[in-house]
């Protein structure tokens, strides 16, 4: 039978999505116990039937990976969790409407920072996602977000930063002092979806100038 309050068994059912990896998470309520089991279903907007997620039926962990099941970028999804306690009490809760394009957050980019004598080069590597194109190959963030660009900053000293930005993958900050340490930060920006990744940071030192030795 249903508990007096579903929140006694189950709370905070939500998608946590990063770079299109979509994980359903939840918490047990105050009356949840370690032997409470959880079963997960999902569906798309306007569909009547919930689909049971294989591998996430009568589980005791509090997360379920729904990346594959929620992989259509233009679709809206829901998931719901049914908790059943050892005593047979049950509660069901569903997520808010989930759009991976809208709700996914961006991880820091993968960047290689290369020291030179009077410059620092930064090479941004394409970010793969679990989303697959029609021919089966994995799409990168750049494939998905056509207005994606990179914002790069080099902290020269406490009061001066140099900035670069664009859609290309290779950047270089010139005119630097040799044998000096700099802090670089690189972020991914997607204006149309108001997305900004956490920064990738690299602390790099320009090479000593050997021309006078």
């Amino acid at each position: 039978h249903a508990p007096e309050d579903p929140s006694d068994l189950l709370q905070h059912v939500k998608f946590q999505s990063s770079n299109f990896e979509n994980i359903l998470t939840w918490d047990s309520g105050p009356e949840g116990t370690p032997d409470t089991v959880y079963s997960i279903e999902y569906k798309t907007y306007g569909e009547r039937d919930w689909v049971a997620k294989k591998g996430c039926q009568r589980i005791t962990r509090k997360s379920c990976n729904l990346t594959v099941e929620t992989g259509n970028l233009t679709e809206l999804y829901y998931a719901r969790v049914t908790a059943v306690s050892a005593g047979g009490r049950s509660a069901t809760k569903m997520t808010d409407r989930f759009s991976s394009l809208q709700h996914t957050t961006l991880k820091p980019p993968d960047v290689t920072c290369i020291s030179k004598v009077r410059s620092i080069q930064m090479i941004v590597h394409p970010t793969p996602t679990p989303i697959r194109a029609g021919d089966g190959h994995r799409l990168t963030l750049e494939d998905i977000f056509h207005d994606l660009f990179y914002h790069l900053e080099l902290q020269v000293n406490r009061t001066y930063q140099m900035h670069l930005g664009g859609k290309q993958r290779e950047y270089e900050f010139f005119g630097l002092t040799p044998d000096t340490e700099f802090l670089g930060t690189i972020m991914i920006c997607v204006p149309t979806w108001a997305k900004e990744s956490a920064p990738y940071m690299c602390r790099v030192k320009t090479l000593p100038d050997r021309t006078w030795t």
């Epitope: 579903p6 907007y45 306007g46 233009t74 509660a91 069901t92 569903m94």
Partner: antibody
Framework: EVQLVESGGGLVQPGGSLRLSCAAS????????MNWVRQAPGKGLEWIGE????????TYNQKFEARATLTVDQSKNTAYLQMNSLRAEDTAVYYC?????????WGQGTLVTVSS | DIVMTQSPDSLAVSLGERATINCKSS????????????LAWYQQKPGQPPKLLIY???SRESGVPDRFSGSGSGTDFTLTISSLQAEDVAVYYC?????????FGQGTKVEIK
């Protein structure tokens, strides 16, 4: 069997407020979205808004956003519509209706009459 | 807001004859992810709440007689009652759920001639 039963209608003075209840039975309220729709006498249907009873997340028709508040009490399996600053044109039958897009189950409705 | 316009406002049809109700939306209701149209049809009898007949423009709700069918795509939709029965006397509404706010047509009253 899924059932939705509205209550709380009646005569309200202009400028007053109402709080309507929608008691769900036959399913857990938190397993689906709940909507409110109204129908003025002899008129068509007008969507007021929706709530996800699991999270409390609401979406309102902009026309009602300033005056309507949707809430739920999960422990009572009941959804609520509060409407303020009522005027004569708010006289209508108010329905709660289940689902997230179209509406598969409706309550029988409760009549609200705004008059002095 | 998407405006839904039904025609005609009322319709008188002989028992056993076909009744056709049209619904036009002010913008396309084609939902790209499933290539279906976000349109529903309801039947409302006096003193009763609306009853869902059709969703996704052409999917019949469980328990609804097969004389009711929905068709159309984009902005133009039709509800057809292939052989009108006495119990079909009612007001019929279309509703879009493509975008907020959800909106209904003004209704079409079906009577027996």
């Amino acid at each position: 069997e899924v059932q939705l039963v509205e209550s709380g209608g009646g005569l309200v003075q202009p400028g007053g407020s109402l709080r309507l209840s929608c008691a769900a039975s036959g399913y857990s309220l938190t397993a689906d979205y709940m909507n409110w729709v109204r129908q003025a006498p002899g008129k068509g249907l007008e969507w007021i808004g929706e709530i996800n009873p699991s999270t409390g997340t609401t979406t309102y028709n902009q026309k009602f956003e300033a005056r309507a508040t949707l809430t739920v009490d999960q422990s009572k399996n009941t959804a609520y519509l509060q409407m303020n600053s009522l005027r004569a044109e708010d006289t209508a039958v108010y329905y709660c209706a289940r689902f997230d897009a179209y509406f598969d189950y409706w309550g029988q409705g409760t009549l609200v009459t705004v008059s002095s | 807001d998407i405006v839904m316009t039904q025609s005609p406002d009322s319709l008188a049809v002989s028992l056993g004859e076909r009744a056709t109700i049209n619904c036009k939306s002010s913008q396309s209701l084609l939902y790209s992810s499933n290539q279906k149209n976000s349109l529903a049809w309801y039947q409302q009898k006096p003193g009763q709440p609306p009853k869902l007949l059709i969703y996704w423009a052409s999917s019949r709700e469980s328990g609804v007689p097969d004389r009711f069918s929905g068709s159309g795509s984009g902005t133009d939709f039709t509800l057809t009652i292939s052989s009108l029965q006495a119990e079909d006397v009612a007001v019929y509404y279309c509703q879009q759920y493509f975008s907020y706010p959800f909106t209904f047509g003004q209704g079409t009253k079906v009577e027996i001639k």
